[in-house]
């Protein structure tokens, strides 16, 4: 999916008002220096591509993020402010809602959410030069 047509300001507002708090809640009890940020993005569409991938694509050691509150809100934000997004994600979204398995927070998941926090911060500061 090409995130170019998204309403970035609305997504940013949703992140600042609610998604960021859910990410912090998920990471509670973890030191902010515990993980190094290894994933980066260069502009807002690229950041959303990376955020979407890290949030919804299962990875080795962390398969459960899609059912977290921050993920549900991310999905909803992309659906309503990125035209056509939800139609490209139909099967994944239906499966995500149907599967209500026990949530397991692994160290790998904490590391992944730490990367997500970095991507979201970068998304909110698009004019900063890439380090």
């Amino acid at each position: 999916y090409d995130f170019t047509n998204c309403d970035f300001e609305k997504i940013k507002a949703a992140y600042l008002s609610t998604i960021s708090k859910d990410l912090i809640t998920y990471m509670s009890g973890t030191k902010s220096t515990e993980f190094n940020n290894t994933v980066s993005c260069s502009n807002r569409p690229h950041c959303l591509t990376e955020i979407q991938s890290l949030t919804f694509n299962p990875t080795a050691g962390c398969a459960s993020l899609a059912k977290e509150m921050f993920a549900m809100k991310t999905k909803a934000a992309l659906a309503i402010w990125c035209p056509g997004y939800s139609e490209t994600q139909i099967n994944a979204t239906q499966a995500m809602k149907k599967r209500r398995k026990r949530k397991v927070t692994t160290n790998k998941c904490l590391e992944q959410v730490s990367q997500l926090q970095g991507l979201w911060r970068r998304f909110n500061r698009p004019l900063l030069k890439q380090q």
């Epitope: 939800s86 139609e87 239906q94």
Partner: antibody, heavy 120, light 107 residues
């Protein structure tokens, strides 16, 4: 089966506001985007905006920005569309529409429509 | 805003005819194109989404094709219940916009 039932016809004076309701039944309400689409007499369809009730995320067409407010009450599975500063050109049938897929903005289910007449 | 232009605005056809309606977008919308049918005094009904995917419960005589800027809705064999107004709608950018409609009338 999903059903969307809208409030009855309204006659309003220019400059006033109207609030149309859309009650959903048959299935969960919160995770499905509700959009509002209007149709002036003998004219085509015009998307006004939408809401995802679960989180209150809204999106409005620029044309209606500042004049339309879309809200939802999860406890009653009802969405609302309020249009202010009414003028004669706002005379139309107002439809609420919903997708059968989570968060989707497709319009697979429609309300029966609410005729709003703006006349002095 | 993306402009959607349908042609023809109206057409007359007989039961059993093959009918084709076209929709052109003012810019590339990939395959983010939906088709709706509306009968007098009724709400629209979704027929086709994603340019070519048939909505559940819609008869197979309806089909959609195209991508980019040019799209087609085809009714392979027109039935009495198909006389209605047909609208295309783009979902590639906000605001979501509709074509002006094509009225299919009985010849």
């Amino acid at each position: 089966q999903v059903q969307l039932v809208q409030s009855g016809a309204e006659v309003k004076k220019p400059g006033s506001s109207v609030k149309v309701s859309c009650k959903a039944s048959g299935g969960t309400f919160s995770s499905y985007a509700i959009s509002w689409v209007r149709q002036a007499p003998g004219q085509g369809l015009e998307w006004m905006g939408g809401i995802i009730p679960e989180f209150g995320f809204t999106n409005y067409a620029q044309k209606f920005q500042g004049r339309v407010t879309i809200t939802a009450d999860e406890s009653t599975s009802t969405a609302y569309m309020e249009l202010s500063s009414l003028r004669s050109e706002d005379t139309a049938v107002y439809y609420c529409a919903r997708s059968g897929m989570f968060y989707s903005i497709l319009f697979d289910y429609w309300g029966q429509g609410t005729l709003v007449t703006v006349s002095s | 805003d993306i402009q959607m232009t349908q042609s023809p605005s109206s057409l007359s056809a007989s039961v059993g005819d093959r009918v084709t309606i076209t929709c052109r977008a003012s810019q590339d919308i990939y395959n983010y194109l939906n088709w709706y049918q509306q009968k007098p005094g009724k709400a629209p009904k979704l027929l086709i989404y994603g340019a070519s995917s048939l909505q559940s419960g819609v008869p197979s005589r309806f089909s959609g094709s195209g991508s980019g800027t040019d799209f087609t809705l085809t009714i392979s064999s027109l039935q009495p219940e198909d006389f209605a107004v047909y609208y295309c709608q783009q979902q590639n950018d906000y605001p979501l916009t509709f074509g002006q409609g094509t009225k299919v009338e009985i010849k």
